[in-house]
Structures are given as C-alpha cells and as structure tokens.
C-alpha cells in the first residue's frame, strides 16, 4: 500500500467546519478522520466544498464503510449523494422515508438520474410494496414515476395507495400500465357515489373494459373527449351509438373533430350508418343500410 502523506502540524481537523474548504485535497485526505466525518455529515452540506473536495470526503466514507453506508450517514449525505454511483447505492439499506425525502430533495428539479432510480428501487424492494406514503413522496418529486414502472412492478401497488395518485401522474402511462392500475383504482374508489367516483376513476379509464364503460354510460357522467380518446380501442368498439352518446353527454359533438383518429375512427367503422346519423354530426364511414354484420370473433369461437 502507498504510504499516506502525514497531516501537517496543527491542521488535524477536530470538527467538520468551514476552515476545511481551504484545505488542499491531500490535506483533507490526511487531516480529516473518517469517523469524525461520519458523525458530522450533517455539516458537510452547509459548507461550500468543491467537487474535488467532495470526492475526497466520499473516498474517506468508502474506506470506513466498504460494505455500504449506514442510514445515519446516508440521511445527511446532501450534495455528496450526487457523487454516488448506482453501485454504491446498491450496497445501502434505506428504510426511512425521511432519508429518501432528504436525498430526493438534493436531486429536485432534475430528471430522474440512475442514482435516484437505484435508490428508489432499493427503498421499494426493502419495503416489499409501494405503500401510500412512499407513492405520495415519489410522485411529488417525480410526477411521471408511476408510469416508469413495469406492469409487474405496478402489481405490487396496493389499492389503498391509489388515493395518492394525481391525474398528471398518469400522463405518460401506456395501456399495459393502465390495465394493471385500473382494477386497483376501481377497488379503491368502489364506495364512492356516482359523480365523485367518476372524478376519481377518470384518469385510470384507459384500462377499463367494455362492460365498465357500458355501466358508466348509464350514470350521466359526461366524459370529455380527451378521456374518451385514451380509452382502449377494443373496449370502445362494442359500444353502441346510444351508449357513446350517453357516455359523452354534451361532449358527443367532439366526435366530429376526432373522426379520423383512433378509437373514434375504428368505432365509426363498426356502427350502422343509420345509427350514426341519429347523432346529427355528419359522421361518415359506418356500415351502409341493408348490410349484414358478422361478428367474426363469435364465429371463430364456435368453429
């Protein structure tokens, strides 16, 4: 091992204080005791160390805790967290939500970094499930967090946590993710009355099956076009003109503007032109009068 440079006389650090910002890197290495640093980590964030100096401090902690830092140190890492690699973070056992919040605060306003993603993964795995408080915290810092999870990971979200989800948290979710989240939302909001239920479930409807959309059409919900356009095409196709009219209420006239886009386009192709004409919107492309509609899916099932 390379012989370490000795600390100059009178420079041994007795506490972590601002005098250390004037130490050269080798002086920090030689004069700051790692155990002292670990017990006074909360001070590091208040002192404007350079990135090079932070590298030295990190190195000292790595030497002291080769198996990974204890949570008492992790909680006070502050800007030193930005120096950590995903490999460093995988050694940690973070159980406190306060620790998680403290570290997310450091990265606030930035994209989710690999370090943060690893931290969250470690934290959630440690807890066993994505509970409401954790979800609240994560979506507050990263509104798109939920939609970054795989359907398999989302399956560990308990229905009770769905109450923490805001509409914007689902903006980037794809249909596969909404397929997992919708049943949980339905369960979470099941005891609410009609209009309140619709307000809460609306963001999740991209995962709703046909029978649920049919049920909603009987409740005067007045779904807006933006929500309708996010519905699963396979769930919309079996809906009748009357059901869509009831589902959309006054928003039904918006179908004209969307007639070339899915799912409206595909739905129009499945409706009788006669029925579409009753909407008075001039929607074209329905099945002409006198044509027989064969449900091929039913025919396949019978053969």
């Amino acid at each position: 091992e390379v012989e370490k440079t000795a600390c100059p006389s009178g420079k041994k650090a007795r506490e972590i204080d601002e005098s250390l910002i004037f130490y050269k890197k080798w002086e920090l290495e030689a004069c700051v005791d790692a155990a002292l640093l670990a017990t006074q980590m909360d001070r590091v964030n208040a002192i404007p160390f350079t990135y090079e100096q932070l590298d030295v401090l990190k190195h000292k902690l790595d030497e002291l805790y080769p198996q990974g830092y204890p949570e008492s140190v992790i909680q006070h890492l502050g800007y030193l967290f930005l120096k950590m690699s995903p490999e460093d973070i995988r050694k940690w056992n973070v159980t406190s939500l306060e620790t998680l919040k403290a570290l997310l605060e450091v990265n606030k306003g930035h994209e989710m970094s690999p370090q943060v993603a690893t931290l969250i993964d470690r934290f959630v795995k440690g807890r066993g499930q994505l509970d409401k408080d954790t979800l609240d915290t994560l979506t507050a810092f990263y509104p798109g967090y939920l939609c970054s999870l795989s359907p398999e990971e989302l399956s560990s979200v308990p229905p009770s946590s769905i109450w923490a989800v805001r509409p914007q948290d689902l903006d980037t979710c794809d249909p596969r993710q909404l397929d997992v989240l919708y049943p949980k939302a339905r369960l979470a909001f099941q005891n609410m009355n009609g209009s309140e239920y619709f307000v809460k479930i609306q963001s999740f409807l991209g995962g709703a099956p046909t029978e649920d959309l049919k049920a909603l059409s009987q409740q005067n919900v007045s779904m807006d076009l933006a929500t309708f356009m996010k519905l699963r095409t396979d769930a919309v196709l079996p809906l009748t003109v009357a059901e869509v009219q009831k589902l959309l209420g006054p928003h039904v006239e918006g179908l004209k503007a969307e007639e070339r886009h899915r799912p409206v386009r595909d739905w129009i192709l499945r409706q009788r032109q006669d029925d579409l004409d009753t909407l008075g919107l001039g929607l074209q492309g329905g099945i002409p009068n006198g044509y027989l509609v064969l449900d091929l899916s039913m025919q396949e099932a019978l053969s």
Epitope: G10, E18, F22, P48
Partner: antibody, heavy 116, light 110 residues
C-alpha cells in the same frame, strides 16, 4: 480561549488613512479565514472584507473596494485592514471576526471616526 | 437597504415564543448556509446559530434556527428578559462574492 483584539482606531479627517490590526490567540490562526465587519453608530452590521488562510484571494464589500486592503501575517497571528481615502460614512466600530461564512468569534471592536 | 430582509422589531412576554424571519434570494440563503447573531446593548455580536440550525456550545437550546428555500428563521422559545437584544441573520452571497447581513431585528421583552 479564543481572543481577538483590535487596535488602530481613532479620529481621522476625510481623505485620510488608518491601519487597523487584529491580534488573534487561542486557535491555529493560519488554518482559518478572517473577516472585518463594521457597525455605524445606531445602525446594523455591515461586512467589510474577508481573507482566506493563505491570502490567495481577498474579498471586499462594494462600498470599500479600491480604498481598503485586507492582509494577514500568519507568523504574527495578526489580521490587518489598511483604510485609505476615508469618508464620513466609514465612521463605525470595526470588528475583526474569525471565519468568512459564520463568524464564531468577534473582537470587542475599535472605533473609527472620520470627521473634519 | 440590506440584501437580507428582517422585520425591524419583534416582542413577546416572558415564556412566550418569538420567531424572526430572514428573506433572501437564490444567490445567498438559497445556496449558502445561514448564521444568526445576537448583539446585546453595548457589546460585540455573538454567534447564536450557524450552518442554518447548529448551536455553538453555550447557546441555550431555547434558540433554534431553520432554513427553507430562500428564507430562514430564528425561534426563541421561553423568552427571557436577558434575550432583549438585536438579532442579525447573515449568509455568503455567491453573486456579490461577499457576506451579507439582514438589517437586524430588535427583540423586546414586554
């Protein structure tokens, strides 16, 4: 015990000069940044200048830049403030203080009066 | 006009809790540590709080500091007559490359 003792204050005419000194003891002077802070009669605190341990850079308030010069002699454990082109508005008690980001020890101050 | 803004005065009766605010900007409080100083009449200032919330030894735990964003506050709980003094907040300002103080708050014990 940390002690800071200022000296060199007094009455001076506008346009004149003064040199303040601050003798430090009770800590390793050469490890710490040092500062000068002043307080005009009946007014609040105003930071004047700061100097790191190795004197590599020097920091000044806009109100004194170009007129005041801070320096230190680590072998004598002493901090200095050379004040030139003094104005009436420089009248104040001048304190020397340990550190540059949080002043954990202060001297008792020396009064500088600029008047004709 | 001070770079950091403090209320000019605050008061309370013995035993009460008094809070003093200090508002700055992203270049000072927003990115640097805040300190609080107490100046008793006719004496030199004394450090009360450093690194936002730390108390030097000898400072009673009745004094506490906190920082959030570009603001900081000093709280004095269990107010005593000997707490009657001027209180100043201070922080390094990265834009000015210098230290800045608040205008000071005179605390009166009624």
């Amino acid at each position: 015990e940390v002690q800071l003792l200022e000296s060199g204050g007094g009455l001076v005419q506008p346009g004149g000069s003064l040199r303040l000194s601050c003798a430090a003891s009770g800590f390793t002077f050469s490890n710490y940044a040092m500062s000068w802070v002043r307080q005009a009669p009946g007014k609040g605190l105003e930071w004047v200048s700061g100097i790191p341990p190795d004197s590599a850079s020097k920091y000044y308030a806009d109100s004194v830049r170009g007129r005041f010069t801070v320096s230190r002699d680590n072998s004598k454990n002493t901090l200095y403030l050379q004040m030139n082109s003094l104005r009436a508005e420089d009248t104040a008690v001048y304190y020397c203080a340990k550190n540059m980001l949080s002043f954990d020890y202060w001297g008792q101050g020396t009064l500088v009066t600029v008047s004709s | 006009q001070s770079v950091l803004t403090q209320p000019p005065s605050a008061s309370g009766t013995p035993g009460q809790r008094v809070t003093i605010s200090c508002t700055g900007s992203s270049s000072n409080i927003g990115s640097n540590a805040v300190s609080w100083y107490q100046q008793l009449p006719g004496t030199a200032p004394k450090l009360l709080i450093y690194y936002n919330s730390k108390r030097p030894s000898g400072v009673p735990d009745r004094f506490s500091g906190s920082k959030s964003g570009t603001s900081a506050s000093l709280a004095i709980s269990g107010l005593r007559s000997e707490d009657e003094a001027d209180y100043y907040c201070g922080s390094w300002d990265s834009s000015l490359n210098g230290y800045v103080f608040g205008g000071g708050t005179k605390v009166t014990v009624l």
